[in-house]
């Protein structure tokens, strides 16, 4: 499901419960994904010892992941809530290559990898609502996107697996630095 | 294993650094933080380091306290330092099973710093 | 600010009693909260996490549960070991924080 439990509008398992804030809902989905995340993560760190590998620094290379930096106005000192929005929205977009190229890596956590894609797509949505200057906001090009998913597709399986596996603790991290500042806003 | 070092005797005003040295932790997988104890009084929080190496402080720590890391190490920078600074620094690991959630699963056993 | 109120701030409990230690928080965090069990001359060690998982290790005598700003500690069948501080944690925020830390409290086993 790409919202939480209890978050559709057509549940009224709780009539009682006060409706979620807008902020409380962007939480509520970054922490489900999280979870979603931990799950894939348990998957891959199983299958192989890449979790522990050191060598992780020459695949990252090749990876152009987002990654959340002082300028980005998101961490404590020199906090700037548009300029942080923007980034995570931004971050966001460009994450979801390679959600996409997460999806045939998984066994038995197949569902979990498609829901983390759909949560994501849930959450760029959620955040659209609340940025003021969308503007700033630059859409990943499609067709640079289509030769890095080839791109990465054809890599032999050991970098797939390391690939895999950065993509999994970058996203997981810039996920928790977005949830830090959004409880900031 | 985690590690405190650099604790001491020192006068008002005096500077000082403490240093967390970790083995058997990757330190750009795990938050950190530091938490500090005066003589039979509760635990207070100075700061947290996470993995994108974002630092967060305690609103009264702020300005006087600078955490850093390097890839086996956690320091506590202290400046303009008082009597009531008088306390056991403990340094701890935080737990990244789940996947948010600032719980410190690994404590070191303190380095005790004294202002007088 | 995030604030945690930790009550009692000493409690005195027989051998096989249950103690119950409460924390609150100024604003709801979620069920982040940990709870922390210190010994004299010791570092704190991690007992429980986010509400109610207990830390490997820890005897199921410990139970944790609450939601949004109220949570509980309960000890039952406490044992001499069981004497220390106990401190809640607050995981939610580390942005304009005093302390994530509860004031503590004090278990005395009689």
């Known amino acids: 499901a790409p919202v939480p439990p209890g978050e559709d509008s057509k549940d009224v398992a709780a009539p009682h419960r006060q409706p979620l804030t807008s902020s409380e809902r962007i939480d509520k989905q970054i922490r489900y994904i999280l979870d979603g995340i931990s799950a894939l993560r348990k998957e891959t760190c199983n299958k192989s010892n890449m979790c522990e590998s050191s060598k992780e620094a020459l695949a990252e290379n090749n990876l152009n992941l987002p990654k959340m930096a002082e300028k980005d106005g998101c961490f404590q000192s020199g906090f700037n809530e548009e300029t942080c929005l923007v980034k995570i929205i931004t971050g966001l977009l460009e994450f979801e290559v390679y959600l996409e190229y997460l999806q045939n890596r998984f066994e038995s956590s197949e569902e979990q990898a498609r829901a983390v894609q759909m949560s994501t797509k849930v959450l760029i949505q959620f955040l659209q609502k609340k940025a003021k200057n969308l503007d700033a906001i630059t859409t990943p090009d499609p067709t640079t996107n289509a030769s890095l998913l080839t791109k990465l597709q054809a890599q032999n399986q050991w970098l797939q697996d390391m690939t895999t596996h950065l993509i999994l603790r970058s996203f997981k991290e810039f996920l928790q630095s977005s949830l830090r500042a959004l409880r900031q806003m | 294993s985690v590690e405190e070092s650099g604790g001491r005797l020192v006068t008002p005003g005096t500077p000082l650094t403490l240093t967390c040295t970790v083995s058997?932790?990757?330190?750009?997988?795990?938050?950190m933080s530091w938490v500090r104890q005066a003589p039979g009084k509760g635990l207070e929080w100075i700061g947290y380091i996470y993995t994108d190496s974002s630092t967060y402080y305690a609103n009264w720590a702020k300005g006087r306290f600078t955490i850093s890391k390097t890839s086996t190490t956690v320091d506590l920078k202290m400046t303009s330092l008082t009597t009531e600074d008088t306390a056991t620094y403990f340094c701890?690991?935080?737990?990244?099973?789940?996947?948010?959630?600032?719980?410190?699963?690994?404590w070191g056993p303190g380095t005790l710093v004294t202002v007088s | 600010a995030y604030d945690m109120t930790q009550t009692p701030a000493s409690v005195e409990v027989a051998m096989g009693g249950t103690v119950t230690i409460k924390c609150q928080a100024s604003?709801?965090?979620?069920?982040?909260l940990s709870w922390y069990q210190q010994k004299p001359g010791q570092p704190p060690k991690l007992l429980i996490y986010?509400?109610?998982t207990l830390a490997s290790g820890v005897s199921s005598r410990f139970k944790g549960s609450g939601s949004g700003t109220e949570y509980t500690l309960t000890i039952s069948g406490v044992e001499c070991a069981d004497a220390a501080t106990y401190y809640c944690?607050?995981?939610?925020?580390?942005?304009?924080?005093?302390?994530?830390f509860g004031g503590g409290t004090k278990v005395v086993v009689v």
């Open positions: 944690q607050q995981g939610y925020n580390s942005n304009d924080v005093d302390n994530v």
């Open positions: 986010r509400t109610s």
């Open positions: 701890a690991k935080g737990s990244t099973d789940y996947a948010f959630d600032t719980r410190l699963d690994l």
């Open positions: 604003q709801s965090i979620s069920n982040e």
């Open positions: 058997g932790i990757d330190l750009s997988s795990y938050d």
